[in-house]
């Protein structure tokens, strides 16, 4: 058993039929010695008396809020949560496996630049009685500070018969140099509690590996005189690290006909303009990627040819 | 300890081309190592990230763009003195800081070159003949060093009398390649910045 936060404890259980469970001793936080009784949750049934209560925790029915009272007055609470271990593996029932970039990916994180700011998100089908808390650091043995906000519900989607909920959190490394060469990864730890079930999820990464620039901005077409051609131009996204001559981007320019069957024409360039033959109903798209360290491409910025 | 904005003459900064080749060569070699050594811990997640230049050179700090010198987190107290000549400098107006930056890059390359050559000598003794260093990568390191044109004592190639442990050598190769790729990215960013200045 260990303390998650004040008056909240996690009991780690091997989860299999007829498992013996864990013996837990609860102590009432009071100077009082006599006339103390214990109850569980909203029940008025007295579970025991005395300053300590010994219980055998085997299943979710044994978890919950234990309260010690004296003469009708509440003295203290202890909330017991269960953390299940099945076949030596901690349960991952609360969050959905996003399977990207590999199986057992529950947390996904992205950074728009090298400032040390990043966003992580996760998915669940659970809609109520759900809380998350997020901690992060750079390295684990001698951790350096990373500050995370509160996790918030950022999107809801319908997937078949199920509703899916996306939660996200923003974190910022306390003293980040955009030009630094990372040797210790960022560690992100998410504690998830659903009713009386506790689970924890972790992710470890270098900022350089989770970079995904915003799409290029101000994508514009300028028709060229006496020609079917247009000059396409765009700019670095505002959120990208500066100076741009140091943090350079590569761009992918694509021309796509109206029909998905039409072959796309595309090219990669380090410049912020190109000349395109604009066909009716075609669209021109541009996306960006760090020029020197190939992490993710940005989403496309697109304009119609017409 | 930062790069000035008004640096080389217009026209192709001679080291940019070499640094682009360097990054391409290191990335290709790392990819080859990851494929060939698929049953060894050779991915970024599996290896320990070590920097053989740590406390010996200060490339990131010496080559910091002017715009980042206001960022407290980027300013490290380490000071290192280097020789200040070199043909990539391309202009008399080049400041001492830029010379410091380029000589730091040169020292990095020299250190990695020695490590890679020592490692290659060991890999050539491996009866499995599983992996060797790409000669193109070694040549590209050499070309960039020549373009930087700094004079410094040659570091003798390390020789070892004991029987090499090929498993450990291959893991060390992965560690070295990952670290060198990260440094090659920094070098490419620096050269691009100087070329645009």
């Amino acid at each position: 058993i260990w303390e998650l936060k004040k008056d909240v404890y996690v009991v780690e259980l091997d989860w299999y039929p007829d498992a013996p469970g864990e013996m837990v001793v609860l102590t009432c936080d009071t100077p009082e010695e006599d006339g103390i009784t214990w109850t569980l949750d909203q029940s008025s049934e007295v579970l025991g008396s005395g300053k300590t209560l010994t219980i055998q925790v085997k299943e979710f029915g044994d978890a919950g809020q234990y309260t010690c009272h004296k003469g009708g007055e509440v003295l203290s609470h202890s909330l017991l949560l269960l953390h299940k271990k099945e076949d030596g593996i901690w349960s991952t029932d609360i969050l959905k496996d996003q399977k990207e970039p590999k199986n057992k990916t529950f947390l996904r994180c992205e950074a728009k630049n090298y400032s040390g700011r990043f966003t992580c998100w996760w998915l669940t089908t659970i809609s109520t009685d759900l809380t998350f808390s997020v901690k992060s650091s750079r390295g684990s043995s001698d951790p350096q500070g990373v500050t995370c906000g509160a996790a918030t519900l950022s999107a809801e989607r319908v997937r078949g018969d199920n509703k899916e909920y996306e939660y996200s959190v923003e974190c910022q490394e306390d003293s980040a140099c955009p030009a630094a060469e990372e040797s210790l990864p960022i560690e992100v730890m998410v504690d998830a509690v659903h009713k009386l079930k506790y689970e924890n999820y972790t992710s470890s990464f270098f900022i350089r590996d989770i970079i995904k620039p915003d799409p290029p901005k101000n994508l514009q077409l300028k028709p060229l005189k006496n020609s079917r051609q247009v000059e396409v131009s765009w700019e670095y996204p505002d959120t990208w690290s500066t100076p741009h001559s140091y943090f350079s981007l590569t761009f992918c320019v694509q021309v796509q006909g109206k029909s998905k069957r039409e072959k796309k024409d595309r090219v990669f360039t380090d410049k912020t303009s190109a000349t395109v033959i604009c066909r009716k109903n075609a669209s021109i798209s541009v996306r960006a990627q760090d020029r020197y360290y190939s992490s993710s491409w940005s989403e496309w910025a697109s304009v119609p040819c017409s | 300890r930062n790069l000035p904005v008004a640096t080389p003459d217009p026209g192709m900064f001679p080291c940019l081309h070499h640094s682009q080749n360097l990054l391409r060569a290191v990335s290709n070699m790392l990819q080859k190592a990851r494929q060939t050594l698929e049953f060894y811990p050779c991915t970024s997640e599996e290896i320990d990230h070590e920097d053989i230049t740590k406390d010996k050179t200060s490339t990131v700090e010496a080559c910091l763009p002017l715009e980042l010198t206001k960022n407290e987190s980027c300013l490290n107290s380490r000071e290192t003195s280097f020789i200040t000549n070199g043909s990539c400098l391309a202009s008399r107006k080049t400041s001492f800081m830029m010379a410091l930056c380029l000589s730091s890059i040169y020292e990095d390359l020299k250190m990695y070159q020695v490590e890679f050559k020592t490692m290659n000598a060991k890999l050539l003794m491996d009866p499995k003949r599983q992996i060797f260093l790409d000669q193109n990568m070694l040549a590209v390191i050499d070309e960039l060093m020549q373009a930087l044109n700094f004079n410094s004592e040659t570091v003798p190639q390390k020789s070892s009398l004991e029987e090499p442990d090929f498993y450990k050598t291959k893991i060390k190769l992965c560690i070295l390649l990952h670290a060198f790729r990260i440094r090659a990215v920094t070098i490419d960013r620096v050269m691009s910045y100087l070329n645009a200045s």
Epitope: C252, D265, V267, F268, I277 | R24
Partner: nanobody, 126 residues
Framework: EVQLVESGGGLVQAGDSLRLSCAAS????????MGWFRQAPGKEREFVAY????????DHADSVKGRFTISRDNAKNTVYLQMNSLRPEDTAVYYC???????????????????WGQGTQVTVSS
């Protein structure tokens, strides 16, 4: 393997025009991004223009923009460089190059190109 042969170079007066051609062998021509580069004596080889595999996207170096135009004919396995308003500073050996699309090459960088022609000399006198 792609073989590239340039033609159309020569000696012209400033203000004149020239059209360079580059004929490629092989059936996979339409899977290559094509580029033109040039090298003046004692100088680095520099980017002039590129064109995408389908011929819809192109770009030119700032120094030639508005004067030179790159185009391709995939049916003829040929890429062209139309050079108008030529200047003495355009004097150089012009090279045609091919970069395999599958490698996702950055089209403005010479080292990203896999195959090169022998070059054709363009001399512009004042």
């Amino acid at each position: 393997e792609v073989q590239l042969v340039e033609s159309g170079g020569g000696l012209v007066q400033a203000g004149d025009s020239l059209r360079l051609s580059c004929a490629a062998s092989g059936r996979t021509f339409s899977t290559y991004v094509m580029g033109w580069f040039r090298q003046a004596p004692g100088k680095e080889r520099e980017f002039v223009a590129y064109i995408s595999t389908g011929g819809l996207i192109s770009d030119h170096a700032d120094s030639v923009k508005g004067r030179f135009t790159i185009s391709r004919d995939n049916a003829k396995n040929t890429v062209y460089l139309q050079m108008n308003s030529l200047r003495p500073e355009d004097t150089a050996v012009y090279y045609c190059a091919a970069a395999s699309r599958t490698r996702r090459p950055i089209a403005t960088i010479k080292d990203e190109y896999d195959y090169w022609g022998q070059g054709t000399q363009v001399t512009v006198s004042s």
